[in-house]
């Protein structure tokens, strides 16, 4: 058993049929010594008396808010949560496996630049009685500071019969140099509590590996005289690291119709303009990627050909 | 300790091409190592990230773009002294700081070159003959060093009398390649910045 936060405790349980469970001793936070009784949740049934209460925690029915009272007055609470371990593996029931970039990916993180700011998100099908708390650091043995905000519900989607909820959090490394060469990864730890179930999820990454630039901005077309060709130009996104001559991007320019199966024109360039063949009912799209360290491509920025 | 913006004339920066080739060569070699050594811990997640130039050179700090010198997190106070007479300095107006930056890059290359050559000698003794260093990568390191053209005492190639542990050597190769790729990215960024300045 360990303390998650004040008056909230996590009991780690090996979860299998007829498991013996864990013996837990609760102590009432009071100078009083006599006349103390214990109850669980909203029940008025007295579980025991005395300053300490010893319980055998085996299942979710044994978890919850234990309260010690004296003469009708509440003295203190202890909330017990369960963390299940099945076949040596901690449960991951609360969050959905996003399976990208690999299986057992529950947390996904992205950074728009090298400033040390990043966003992580996760998915769940649970809509109520759900709380998250996020901590992060650079390295684990001698951790350096990363400050994370509160996790918020950022999107809701319908997936077949189910509703899916996306939560996200923004974090900022306290003293980040965009030009630094990372040797210690960022660690992100998410505590998830659903009703009386506790789970924790972690992700470890270098900012350089989670870079995904914003799409290029200000796409413009200039038709070339006596030609099917069009000159398309664009600018670096505002959120990208500066100076751009140091933090350079490379671009992919594509002309394609509405369907992905349609024919296309595609060209890669390090410049902020390119010449392509425009077709009726097609769109010109441009996306960006770090020129020197191939992490993710940005989303597409598009303009219609006409 | 930074690069001023008034540096070489446009198109007068012969190191840019070599640095681009360097990054391609090391990325290619790392990809090859990850494929060939698929049953060894050779991915970024599996290896320890070591920097053989730590406390010996200060490339990131010495080559910091002017725009980032306002960022206190970028201003580490590691001081190193360098020789300053490189041929990539295509203009006489080149500052002392830029010379310091380029000589730091030269020292990095020299250190990695020695490590890679020592390692290759060990890998050539491996009866499995599983992996060797790409001669193209070694040649590209050499070309960039020649383009930088700094006078520096030669570092003797390390020789070891004991029987090499090929498993450890291959893991060290992965560690070295990952670190060198990161440094090659920095070098490419610096050369691109200098070329644009």
């Amino acid at each position: 058993i360990w303390e998650l936060k004040k008056d909230v405790y996590v009991v780690e349980l090996d979860w299998y049929p007829d498991a013996p469970g864990e013996m837990v001793v609760l102590t009432c936070d009071t100078p009083e010594e006599d006349g103390i009784t214990w109850t669980l949740d909203q029940s008025s049934e007295v579980l025991g008396s005395g300053k300490t209460l010893t319980i055998q925690v085996k299942e979710f029915g044994d978890a919850g808010q234990y309260t010690c009272h004296k003469g009708g007055e509440v003295l203190s609470h202890s909330l017990l949560l369960l963390h299940k371990k099945e076949d040596g593996i901690w449960s991951t029931d609360i969050l959905k496996d996003q399976k990208e970039p690999k299986n057992k990916t529950f947390l996904r993180c992205e950074a728009k630049n090298y400033s040390g700011r990043f966003t992580c998100w996760w998915l769940t099908t649970i809509s109520t009685d759900l709380t998250f708390s996020v901590k992060s650091s650079r390295g684990s043995s001698d951790p350096q500071g990363v400050t994370c905000g509160a996790a918020t519900l950022s999107a809701e989607r319908v997936r077949g019969d189910n509703k899916e909820y996306e939560y996200s959090v923004e974090c900022q490394e306290d003293s980040a140099c965009p030009a630094a060469e990372e040797s210690l990864p960022i660690e992100v730890m998410v505590d998830a509590v659903h009703k009386l179930k506790y789970e924790n999820y972690t992700s470890s990454f270098f900012i350089r590996d989670i870079i995904k630039p914003d799409p290029p901005k200000n796409l413009q077309l200039k038709p070339l005289k006596n030609s099917r060709q069009v000159e398309v130009s664009w600018e670096y996104p505002d959120t990208w690291s500066t100076p751009h001559s140091y933090f350079s991007l490379t671009f992919c320019v594509q002309v394609q119709g509405k369907s992905k199966r349609e024919k296309k024109d595609r060209v890669f360039t390090d410049k902020t303009s390119a010449t392509v063949i425009c077709r009726k009912n097609a769109s010109i799209s441009v996306r960006a990627q770090d020129r020197y360290y191939s992490s993710s491509w940005s989303e597409w920025a598009s303009v219609p050909c006409s | 300790r930074n690069l001023p913006v008034a540096t070489p004339d446009p198109g007068m920066f012969p190191c840019l091409h070599h640095s681009q080739n360097l990054l391609r060569a090391v990325s290619n070699m790392l990809q090859k190592a990850r494929q060939t050594l698929e049953f060894y811990p050779c991915t970024s997640e599996e290896i320890d990230h070591e920097d053989i130039t730590k406390d010996k050179t200060s490339t990131v700090e010495a080559c910091l773009p002017l725009e980032l010198t306002k960022n206190e997190s970028c201003l580490n106070s590691r001081e190193t002294s360098f020789i300053t007479n490189g041929s990539c300095l295509a203009s006489r107006k080149t500052s002392f700081m830029m010379a310091l930056c380029l000589s730091s890059i030269y020292e990095d290359l020299k250190m990695y070159q020695v490590e890679f050559k020592t390692m290759n000698a060990k890998l050539l003794m491996d009866p499995k003959r599983q992996i060797f260093l790409d001669q193209n990568m070694l040649a590209v390191i050499d070309e960039l060093m020649q383009a930088l053209n700094f006078n520096s005492e030669t570092v003797p190639q390390k020789s070891s009398l004991e029987e090499p542990d090929f498993y450890k050597t291959k893991i060290k190769l992965c560690i070295l390649l990952h670190a060198f790729r990161i440094r090659a990215v920095t070098i490419d960024r610096v050369m691109s910045y200098l070329n644009a300045s």
Epitope: R261, E262, K263, K264, V267, F268, T269, D270, T275 | -
Partner: antibody, heavy 118, light 107 residues
Framework: EVQLVQSGAEVKKPGATVKISCKAS????????LHWVRQAPEKGLEWMGW????????EYAPKFQGRVTITADTSTDTGYLELSSLRSEDTAVYYC???????????WGQGTLVTVSS | DIQMTQSPSSVSASVGDRVTITCRAS??????LHWYQQKPGKAPKLLIY???QSISGVPSRFSGYGSGTDFSLTINSLQPEDFATYYC?????????FGGGTKVEIK
Amino acid sequence: EVQLVQSGAEVKKPGATVKISCKASGYTFSDYYLHWVRQAPEKGLEWMGWIDPENGDTEYAPKFQGRVTITADTSTDTGYLELSSLRSEDTAVYYCAANKELRYFDVWGQGTLVTVSS
Amino acid sequence: DIQMTQSPSSVSASVGDRVTITCRASQSISINLHWYQQKPGKAPKLLIYFASQSISGVPSRFSGYGSGTDFSLTINSLQPEDFATYYCQQSNSFPLTFGGGTKVEIK
């Protein structure tokens, strides 16, 4: 199976015009760009131009501009290359090639040898 | 027009050898470069597109590499069926242009 089948060999006199065909099968004709590339004996490959069969848009290499016409007939799934004012240096194998991507060539015809000789 | 220069123009090699062919562009073409194999009397066949992207059905011993102006095609462990002429082609701008070809011959 995506396939391009070209018409047979041609022998032409200098100054004449040649028209060769390229019949597509195994895909929707207008879904791919169609190019023409030639190869002189013991020489390399030379791109001549392309057509978008969907709308008839064409683009030619400057070297052939004014002498070459590329057309496409969607009713027969056939592309054509017409080259006029033939000279001896036009002796070559002419290939049609197609792809969903405009700038490189995924599927090739078997080639048509055009000999220009007096 | 962008000039593409291949080297060597021919190379003699044995089965099992590792062969590398290079292609240089007269100006930077990013990764807009493609490789083809041509056997005598046959049409060319696409091997690699956009400098390093492999084509399904093409043996994994063929690998492409490079960007900017310098590119290479490597055949790891040359097989009897690999003796042919190889061409690079740039798609950075029109007109599309090819390298002069590299003939891989049996030693």
